[in-house]
């Protein structure tokens, strides 16, 4: 499974699209910034088998896809950019799913790192809660956009580690 090559390119495209999606100046939102507790340790690929790492990546992108597929998200972002971004994420999910199937067949035990998956889910719950509390304001979405760019960047680091494991 040549995940890292295809996935890294897709991730870079997703980051560029997300960068282009900004609608208001982030400098008007400094007071709205929030520590969502990005579980950075879950992006340390050295502690995972390849299958586990792919599962964490999948969860990360699935949750990002879900977040940007809501009605509130549709109202917040320019439609064509949002569609391109979602399509990019969807394509990455398909690639990852194909990789998981392939990798599981090669490993003796398809280990799932439940703690890591849970940490990622809780992280996105905190993001969703923040948006709800801020009533999905433009600044709240701007803060979340920056946070998702940060998390996608971390997942890029995980992909680099995966590439070395190939």
């Amino acid at each position: 499974c040549d995940l890292p090559q295809t996935h890294s390119l897709g991730n870079r495209r997703a980051l560029i699209l997300l960068a282009q999606m900004g609608r208001i100046s982030p400098f008007s939102c400094l007071k709205d910034r929030h520590d969502f507790g990005l579980p950075q340790e879950e992006f340390d690929g050295n502690q995972f088998q390849k299958t586990q790492a792919i599962s964490v990546l999948h969860e990360m992108i699935q949750q990002t896809f879900n977040l940007f597929s809501t009605e509130d998200s549709s109202a917040a972002w320019e439609q064509s950019l949002l569609e391109k971004f979602s399509t990019e994420l969807y394509q990455q999910l398909n690639n990852l799913e194909a990789c998981v199937i392939q990798e599981v067949g090669m490993e003796e035990t398809p280990l799932m790192n439940e703690d890591s998956i849970l940490a990622v889910r809780k992280y996105f719950q905190r993001i969703t809660l923040y948006l709800t509390e801020k009533k999905y304001s433009p600044c709240a979405w701007e803060v979340v956009r920056a946070e998702i760019m940060r998390s996608l960047s971390f997942s890029t680091n995980l992909q680099k580690i995966l590439r070395r494991k190939d």
């Epitope: 980051l15 560029i16 960068a19 282009q20 900004g22 100046s25 982030p26 400098f27 939102c29 400094l30 007071k31 910034r33 929030h34 520590d35 507790g37 803060v143 920056a146 946070e147 760019m149 940060r150």
Partner: antibody, heavy 120, light 111 residues
Framework: QVQLQESGTVLARPGASVKMSCKAS????????MHWVKQRPGQGLEWIGV????????TYNQKFKDKAKLTAVTSANTAYMELSSLTNEDSAVYFC?????????????WGQGTTVTVSS | DIVLTQSPASLAVSLGQRATISCRAS??????????MHWYQQKPGQTPKLLIY???NLESGVPARFSGSGSGTDFTLNIHPVEEEDAATYYC?????????FGSGTKLEIK
Amino acid sequence: QVQLQESGTVLARPGASVKMSCKASGYSFTTYWMHWVKQRPGQGLEWIGVIYPGNGDTTYNQKFKDKAKLTAVTSANTAYMELSSLTNEDSAVYFCTRNYKYDYYTMDYWGQGTTVTVSS
Amino acid sequence: DIVLTQSPASLAVSLGQRATISCRASKSVSTSGHSYMHWYQQKPGQTPKLLIYLASNLESGVPARFSGSGSGTDFTLNIHPVEEEDAATYYCQHSGELPFTFGSGTKLEIK
């Protein structure tokens, strides 16, 4: 690798204007904010402002609002800063620096600096 | 504007000892879990180099002898053990609100 190449030393007369450049390479120029920072000889650092090359959005330190104008040409991967109505106080080294860590607003890569000397 | 007061203005520390630099903000630069204070090192004739971001996070590639701490208005940069190559001027910078400002700098000399 990431590089920010700034224009060379500038000598200007009081009252004149100067425009300096900062050519970026090794990264996606349009997706990172670019800060500009002033450093007078033997003194500290002052934040002038920031530009987003992707759409030209700018934010200034009010102190420099009427002094500096930030622009960018994406086709040339180059950011510019124009300083107007120069006085001796504007004699300094000016750095362009790439924004880092998204909304943490730190600065990772720095240009080598453009030295501006204002003298009659 | 938030004023950052660094102290001392200069200090001389023996090789292998601890250097402690303080940065006090005129107003809190912490909000919702993050402290928006960062530290830079500038050697003579060179550009500043990011050492620490968000008060305590070590930038990639920076030696572990550098550490940062603090929240609200009071922040500290520690270097231990000090090495010859650490001779430089150190600046704090906040990004809590506009305009971002820097401290006046602390010059570290190695004895």
